[in-house]
C-alpha cells in the first residue's frame, strides 16, 4: 500500500505583509524525496513549479519561490503542494499575502516576520477545491506578476 503523504507547509519571508515593490519569498516544505513543489493561488488555475528542491533537515525538503517586486496583484491566498513519485500531496493551508503602500503612516501594519500558515484551513469559495498538478517540470518565467481586478 502506498504511504500517505504528509501535507506540506507554507511560510513567507520576511513575512506576509510586504511593502509595495519589496520582495517576498514563499517557502514550501515537505518530506524528503519531493521531486516538484508547486505554489498555487486560490480560485486560479495558474501555478508555479520548481524542481529546485533542497534538504532543509534530515527529514524535510523545501523549495523557495521569490517575487522580486511585489505589486497589488500579488496579494491574496497562496498554498503549496508537492509531487513525490508517484503521488501528489494534499494542499497546504492557505497563507494570505498582504501588500501595503510604502508611504503608509504610523497605522500601517509592520511586516510580520516569519509568517506561516496556521492549523486552520481557509474555506474555499464553494465545496470544490481549485488548482493543482499538471505535468512535470513546468517552469514559470514569472510569478503571478499582473494586477487583478475583481
Amino acid at each position: 500500500q502506498e504511504e500517505d503523504l504528509p501535507r506540506p507547509s507554507i511560510s513567507a519571508e520576511p513575512g506576509t505583509v510586504i511593502p509595495l515593490g519589496s520582495h517576498v519569498t514563499f517557502v514550501c516544505r515537505g518530506p524528503v524525496g519531493v521531486q516538484t513543489f508547486r505554489l498555487e493561488r486560490e480560485s486560479r488555475s495558474t501555478y508555479n513549479d520548481t524542481e529546485d528542491v533542497s534538504q532543509a533537515s534530515p527529514s524535510e525538503s523545501e523549495a523557495r519561490f521569490r517575487i522580486d517586486s511585489v505589486s497589488e496583484g500579488n496579494a491574496g491566498p497562496y498554498r503549496c503542494i508537492y509531487y513525490k513519485p508517484p503521488k501528489w500531496s494534499e494542499q497546504s493551508d492557505y497563507l494570505e499575502l498582504l501588500v501595503k503602500e510604502t508611504s503608509g503612516g504610523p497605522d500601517s501594519p509592520d511586516t510580520e516576520p516569519g509568517s506561516s500558515a496556521g492549523p486552520t484551513q481557509r474555506p474555499s469559495d464553494n465545496s470544490h477545491n481549485e488548482h493543482a498538478p499538471a505535468s512535470q517540470g513546468l517552469k514559470a518565467e514569472h510569478l503571478y506578476h499582473h494586477h487583478h481586478h475583481h
Epitope: 486560490e42 480560485s43 486560479r44 488555475s45 495558474t46 501555478y47 508555479n48 513549479d49 496583484g73 503542494i81 509531487y83 508517484p86 503521488k87 501528489w88 500531496s89 494534499e90 494542499q91 469559495d125 464553494n126 481549485e130 488548482h131 493543482a132 498538478p133 499538471a134 505535468s135 512535470q136 513546468l138 517552469k139 514559470a140 503571478y144 506578476h145 499582473h146 494586477h147 487583478h148 481586478h149 475583481h150
Partner: antibody
Framework: EQSVESGGGLITPGGTLTLTCTAS????????MNWVRQAPGKGLEWIGY?????KTYYANWAKGRFTISKTSTTVDLKMTSLTAEDTGTYFC??????????????WGPGTLVTISS | ELDMTQTPASVSEPVGGTVTIKCQAS??????LAWYQQKPGQPPKLLIY???RLASGVSSRFGGSGSGTEFTLTISDLECADAATYYC????????????FGGGTEVVVK
C-alpha cells in the same frame, strides 16, 4: 499520448449517465483533466477539472449536477437530472502546459450524448 | 464573474489575406489567455497559450498578442486549411466562472 472518451449514447430526460475518459501514454494524476462539452452547432463550454488527490473545480452552472472523479488511468464525468439542453459532444482534455491547468493541449475525439424521450 | 467576449462571430477573407480576431475578458487575466482552432467533426487544437506563445507544431502564421483584458489572434497569409472556428479561453480563473471560453469566431477562407 492520447485520451479517448466513452459512455455516450441516447438517454431519456431525468436520467443519469457516466462518461469515461481513458488515457494512454500519460498518467492522469499528474495532470489537470478537464471536461468540455459542445452542443450541436454551438460553442465550447467548460464543465470542470480534476487533479492531484481528487481535487475538483467546476463551472458555476455545473455545480451539483456534474461530478468528476478519477482512477490512475481514467477520469469519469457523472451527469444527473439530464435534460435536452445537455445534448452534445463531450470532450476530455488534458491541461497543464504553460503553467495553467486550463491550457488544454491534448483532447480526445469526444463522445456524443443525446437526451431525448 | 469572469466572462469572455469574442468578436467578430464570423469573418471571411481570401487566401493570402490576414484575419484578426479579438477577445475581451470582463476582468484582468494578465497574459493567461489561450486560443484554439476547431474544424468540423474534430476536437479543438491548442494554438497559442499565455497570450502569445505558440503551441508545439503550430505554424508561425498564427500570432497572439495582448494582456489584461484585450487580446488578439492574427492569422496571416491565410490558407484554405485555416478555415475553422477559433475560440479564446481564459486560462487563469477556475473560481466563479460560467464558461472559460469565448463564443467562437468562424473563419471562412475565400
Amino acid at each position: 499520448e492520447q485520451s479517448v472518451e466513452s459512455g455516450g449514447g441516447l438517454i431519456t430526460p431525468g436520467g443519469t449517465l457516466t462518461l469515461t475518459c481513458t488515457a494512454s501514454g500519460f498518467t492522469v494524476t499528474r495532470y489537470y483533466m478537464n471536461w468540455v462539452r459542445q452542443a450541436p452547432g454551438k460553442g465550447l463550454e467548460w464543465i470542470g477539472y480534476i487533479y492531484a488527490s481528487s481535487k475538483t473545480y467546476y463551472a458555476n452552472w455545473a455545480k451539483g449536477r456534474f461530478t468528476i472523479s478519477k482512477t490512475s488511468t481514467t477520469v469519469d464525468l457523472k451527469m444527473t437530472s439530464l435534460t435536452a439542453e445537455d445534448t452534445g459532444t463531450y470532450f476530455c482534455a488534458r491541461g497543464g502546459v504553460g503553467n495553467s491547468g486550463l491550457n488544454l493541449d491534448l483532447w480526445g475525439p469526444g463522445t456524443l450524448v443525446t437526451i431525448s424521450s | 464573474e469572469l466572462d469572455m467576449t469574442q468578436t467578430p462571430a464570423s469573418v471571411s477573407e481570401p487566401v493570402g489575406g490576414t484575419v484578426t480576431i479579438k477577445c475581451q475578458a470582463s476582468q484582468s487575466i494578465g497574459s493567461w489567455l489561450a486560443w484554439y482552432q476547431q474544424k468540423p467533426g474534430q476536437p479543438p487544437k491548442l494554438l497559442i497559450y499565455q497570450a502569445s506563445r505558440l503551441a508545439s507544431g503550430v505554424s508561425s502564421r498564427f500570432g497572439g498578442s495582448g494582456s489584461g483584458t484585450e487580446f488578439t489572434l492574427t492569422i496571416s497569409d491565410l490558407e484554405c486549411a485555416d478555415a475553422a472556428t477559433y475560440y479564446c479561453q481564459q486560462a487563469e480563473y477556475s473560481g466563479d466562472v460560467e464558461n472559460t471560453f469565448g463564443g467562437g469566431t468562424e473563419v471562412v477562407v475565400k
